[in-house]
C-alpha cells in the first residue's frame, strides 16, 4: 500500500505540539512504530527518539480506506534547549518499510520568541514565546 508521513506543529498557549502523522490503510497499522527524533541526522531510530508510538489496528474502523495515526510531542514551554533539527519517522520491521519525514527546525531567538521552519503544510510558523500567539 501507499504509506506516507507528514510533520506539523500547533500552538496552545505556551505549549508547542509537534505532530507526526502517518497515513496508511487500516490493515497496515500493526507492526509500525512512529517516532520523533531531534538532532539525529543519520541514526534516527525508536531507541534514540524523543517519543515513539506503536500503531495498533483499530477494530472499530470499518472499510479499507486510508486512515491516519498521530504521534504528538508536547513542549510545555519552549526554551533554547529545544532549538534543533527534528524529524518524524516510521518503520515496520515486519514489512521492511521505513519512512523518513522532512527535517524541520525550531529556532529560539534572542527576543524570547521561536520559529518553526521546514514544515510542509505550513512553510513557516513563527510563535511568540511570551504571549503564546501565532505571529
Amino acid at each position: 500500500g501507499c504509506i506516507n508521513i507528514t510533520s506539523s506543529a500547533s500552538q496552545e498557549g505556551t505549549r508547542l505540539n509537534l505532530i507526526c502523522t502517518v497515513w496508511h490503510k487500516k490493515e497496515e497499522a500493526e507492526g509500525f512504530v512512529v517516532f520523533l527524533c531531534k538532532d539525529r541526522s543519520g541514526d534516527c531510530s525508536p531507541e534514540t527518539s524523543l517519543k515513539q508510538l506503536r500503531l495498533k489496528r483499530d477494530p472499530g474502523i470499518d472499510g479499507v480506506g486510508e486512515i491516519s495515526s498521530q504521534l504528538m510531542f508536547t513542549i510545555s514551554q519552549v526554551t533554547p534547549l529545544h532549538s534543533g533539527t527534528y524529524q518524524c519517522c516510521a518503520r515496520s520491521q515486519k514489512s521492511g518499510i521505513r519512512l523518513q519525514g522532512h527535517f524541520f527546525s525550531i529556532l529560539f531567538t534572542e527576543t524570547g520568541n521561536y520559529t518553526v521552519t521546514g514544515l510542509k503544510q505550513r512553510q513557516h510558523l513563527e510563535f511568540s514565546h511570551n504571549e503564546g500567539t501565532l505571529s
Epitope: G31, S45, R54, K94, S95, G96, I97, R98, L99, Q100
Partner: antibody
Framework: QVNLQESGPGLVRPSETLSLTCTVS????????VNWFRQPPGKGLEWMGT???????DYNSALKSRLSISRDTSKSQVFLKMNSLQTEDTAIYFC??????WGQGVMVTVSS | DIQMTQSPASLSASLGETVSIECLTS??????SAWYQQKSGKSPQLLIY???RLQDGVPSRFSGSGSGTRYSLKISGMQPEDEADYFC?????????FGSGTKLEIK
Amino acid sequence: QVNLQESGPGLVRPSETLSLTCTVSGFSLISYGVNWFRQPPGKGLEWMGTIWNDGGTDYNSALKSRLSISRDTSKSQVFLKMNSLQTEDTAIYFCARGFEHWGQGVMVTVSS
Amino acid sequence: DIQMTQSPASLSASLGETVSIECLTSEDISNDSAWYQQKSGKSPQLLIYAASRLQDGVPSRFSGSGSGTRYSLKISGMQPEDEADYFCQQSYKYPLTFGSGTKLEIK
C-alpha cells in the same frame, strides 16, 4: 507473487570475501526493504543487516566491520559482501522481504 | 544485545495436544516479538508478529501472547504438519536477535 532467490558461491576459502545476490520479484525494492539472515548448520538464526526501501542500511554490530549490503533497484537485486571469512561463517544465508517473505537460502561453506 | 532465552529446547507432543513455547527477554521489548516456524530443509515462516498478531495465512491454532519480558507461542491442537523448529525473535532494538529454538516432534 513475492519471490526472493539467493545466489552465490557454495565454497569460499578462509580470509576471502563472500559475495551473494538476492534477486527479487513481485515487489519493488523502492517500496520494501530486504534483510539478510544466516543460520549455521543445525543452529539458530542470526540477523546480519537490512537495506531499507529508501536505500539506508542497518547492520549487526558484530558483523558491521566486514559487512556491506547494497542494491540495484533497476535489476531488483540486493547484494551482500562480507570479507575476512572464517570457518565459523559457514551457514545457510537467507534474504527476506521484511520478516514476511524469505528466500530458500544458499549454503555457503568456508573451507580450505 | 537483547538476549532471548527460549524454552524448552525440545518438545514431544501427541496429535491434538496443546503445546506452549516460551521466550524470556533480557529487557522489556514492548511487544516487538515474533515467532517463526522452520521445517526441515526449509526457510523460516513468520507465524506471529507484534507479540500476538497472526500473520496472514497462518492457521488459527497458532497464537501468541505476552508482554514486557515474557512471550509465548501456543499451538492449540497439534497437527502432523506442525512438526518443526520454532524460533522467537525481538525487533525492539538492534541487533535483532533470536531465541535458540525449540524442536517440536510428534510423540
